[in-house]
């Protein structure tokens, strides 16, 4: 642990002014793992003037950084690039004359305290004023800056010409697109100072290329993947003062696929588990031995988890018997196509027969072939229906 500091497994604090530290504290190679440090507290270190790019990067778990009553004058732009967990920064009463928002743009800070620094009034610190205004909370800091006349003026009153937030405007066509197709988005940005423009595509899977000038840009997404459905695409305008973004959600339409269909499992109910992907949401159709399976309170489809365009569920059966053994086919269908998978289900053996030798299909019960399923004129026959799992009703008619 550096001189003038104390260290624990999760904290470093340096508050002893003598002899004090001249550089940001670094741990010896064989001491505490820097990744476990969550708080660094520095006070009364008049000779600590700079935070360099690589000073803080080892402390990836850092959540709270406090440097107060010290001599901090300069913070490198990429100083906190690796510290994505940072939530609280307190730079009270230091020697900062300027501070760029680029230090903090990637952080989700809940607190940034900058009271008592001799900021120079310029467009460079206008972002701090904007941040304060956005917070509009009762604990707003009293921040001041020195104007050209070396007069301290409240940051809240700071007026700088040609220094404002930028704007971004995304001109997108209907962002509902069929899988495999391509699309081009256009964006224009404006502001003074002139903003930079960039695209934030997150973890977009589809191939994409952008062409960007200062105030205009286009993003071409080709051979769009169904995996990108629901993803957000943003056009971002950024300048010294802050940033603005205009976003659209990508909706990808694609034919269904049944990615999973398995033999039944028994829990509270019997369940034939399945996973279906598709957009728009596929209609699900079940067939039993090739015939329509009309769902009822005893046999029905349950969707347990919906993950945007993926549906996990069960064909749920209450107390199935040997009468329900057979082939179950699932068809998933939307306007872009359909998929189909089939499994054989064996719920229980035939009564009085050794389970191992049981027939898998209930064909034996249909002895009169003359009145089989699709003999449409015969209204008495119900051999094309799945037998009900309701023990009280053996006809296959649920209601």
């Amino acid at each position: 642990c550096p001189t003038s500091c104390k260290c624990s497994a999760s904290r470093i604090w340096c508050s002893d002014p003598s002899p004090g530290i001249v550089a940001f504290p670094r741990l010896e190679p064989n001491s505490v793992d820097p990744e476990n440090i969550t708080e660094i507290f520095i006070a009364n270190q008049k000779r600590l003037e700079i935070i360099n790019e690589d000073d803080v990067e080892a402390y990836v778990g850092l959540r709270n950084l406090t440097i107060v009553d010290s001599g901090l004058k300069f913070v490198a732009h990429k100083a906190f690039l690796k510290n994505s967990n940072l939530q609280h920064i307190n730079f009270t009463r230091n020697k900062l004359t300027s501070l760029s928002r680029k230090h903090f743009r990637h952080l989700d800070l809940s607190e940034l305290i900058l009271v008592g620094n001799p900021f120079t009034c310029s467009c460079d610190i206008m972002w701090i004023k904007t941040l304060q205004e956005a917070k509009s909370s009762p604990d707003t800091q009293d921040l001041y800056c020195l104007n050209e006349s070396s007069k301290n003026i409240p940051l809240a009153n700071l007026q700088i010409p040609n220094c404002g937030l930028p704007s971004a405007n995304l001109a997108a066509p209907n962002l509902t697109v069929e899988e495999g197709k391509s699309i081009t988005l256009s964006c224009s940005v404006a502001g003074d100072p002139v903003p930079n423009m960039y695209w934030d595509v997150g973890n977009l899977v589809s191939k994409h290329m952008n062409e960007t000038s200062h105030t205009q840009g286009s993003l071409r997404i080709t051979n769009i993947s169904s995996d990108d459905s629901g993803k957000q695409i943003s056009c971002v305008a950024e300048n010294l003062v802050g940033e603005d973004q205009d976003s659209v959600n990508l909706t990808v339409h694609f034919a269904p696929t049944i990615t999973f269909l398995e033999s039944p499992t028994s829990d509270h109910h019997w369940c034939i588990p399945f996973t279906v992907k598709g957009n728009p949401k596929p209609a699900l159709q079940w067939f039993y031995n090739g015939a329509i399976l009309n769902e009822s309170k005893y046999i029905c489809t349950k969707i347990h988890v919906t993950n945007h365009t993926e549906y996990h569920g069960c064909l749920q059966l209450d107390n199935p018997t040997h009468m329900n053994n057979g082939d179950y086919t699932l068809i998933a269908k939307n306007e872009y196509g359909k998929d189909e998978k089939q499994i054989s289900a064996h719920f229980m053996g035939w009564p009085g027969i050794d389970d191992g030798a049981n027939p898998n299909y209930p064909d034996v019960i249909y002895e009169d072939y003359g009145t089989a399923a699709n003999d449409i004129g015969d209204t008495t026959n119900r051999s094309n229906e799945i037998p009900s799992t309701d023990v009280t009703d053996k006809t296959g008619r649920e209601h």
């Epitope: 696929t257 209609a283 159709q285 067939f287 090739g290 015939a291 329509i292 009309n294 068809i331 306007e335 359909k338 998929d339 189909e340 089939q342 399923a373 699709n374 449409i376 094309n384």
Partner: antibody
């Protein structure tokens, strides 16, 4: 129980049109495609096309393109097949069939006779 | 269009004996989703067709187990293990993989 019940026999003159209906019961009509198949006397089966009763979308065999129109009325769970510009070659039994890529259910058939 | 060729077109059989009808398609019937939509239909005199077998080998609900289907790709077979009097009629193979759907044609005679 699934049933497809078709309209009665028709006699038409050459050049006229015929509209055959198929009323479905025993299942959710809008959930499954309805196909139409015809069978000339003493001949085999010939697929004409299908309709998706939910969207009203259709697909017709090339041979019947421009002459056949498939429609539906979801309020009464009924599909219709209209064939225009009839000739004597259109004399056949017309079947509605459903509901998947294997034709599990068939109507009883409607005999359409085209004769001058 | 996919051409479905059945053979034999006429098959005299004796009651209680086995019978077999074959069907060949002019191209593979394997759908892009991996399924093969080859069905066998039976049409008794004066009646609409009825489904016996779907997707090559799956017996439709209520169909006796003396009917079985087999095959793959372009060659398919319908077998009746023991022919009964009620089995007389015309048997069609049908493909539902490629539009337009098409049918073969065959006959089974009882002697």
């Amino acid at each position: 129980q699934v049933q497809l019940v078709q309209s009665g026999a028709e006699v038409k003159k050459p050049g006229a049109s015929v509209k055959v209906s198929c009323k479905a019961s025993g299942y959710t009509f809008t959930a499954y495609d309805m196909h139409w198949v015809r069978q000339a006397p003493g001949q085999g089966l010939e697929w004409m096309g299908w309709i998706d009763p939910n969207s009203g979308g259709t697909r017709y065999a090339q041979k019947f393109q421009g002459r056949v129109t498939m429609t539906r009325d979801t309020s009464i769970s009924t599909a219709y097949m209209e064939l225009s510009r009839l000739t004597s070659d259109d004399t056949a039994v017309y079947y509605c069939a459903g509901v998947t890529s294997w034709f599990a259910y068939w109507g009883q058939g409607t005999l359409v006779t085209v004769s001058s | 269009d996919v051409v479905m060729t059945q053979s034999p077109l006429s098959l005299p059989v004796t009651l209680g004996q086995p019978a077999s009808i074959s069907c060949r398609s002019s191209q593979s019937l394997v759908h892009s989703n991996g399924n093969t939509y080859l069905s066998w239909l039976q049409q008794r005199p004066g009646q609409p067709p009825r489904l016996l077998i779907y997707k090559i080998s799956n017996r439709f609900s209520g169909v006796p187990d003396r009917f079985s289907g087999s095959g793959a790709g372009t060659d398919f077979t319908l077998k009746i293990s023991r022919v009964e009097a009620e089995d007389v009629g015309v048997y069609y193979c049908m493909q539902g993989t490629h539009e337009p759907y098409t049918f073969g044609q065959g006959k089974l005679e009882i002697k």
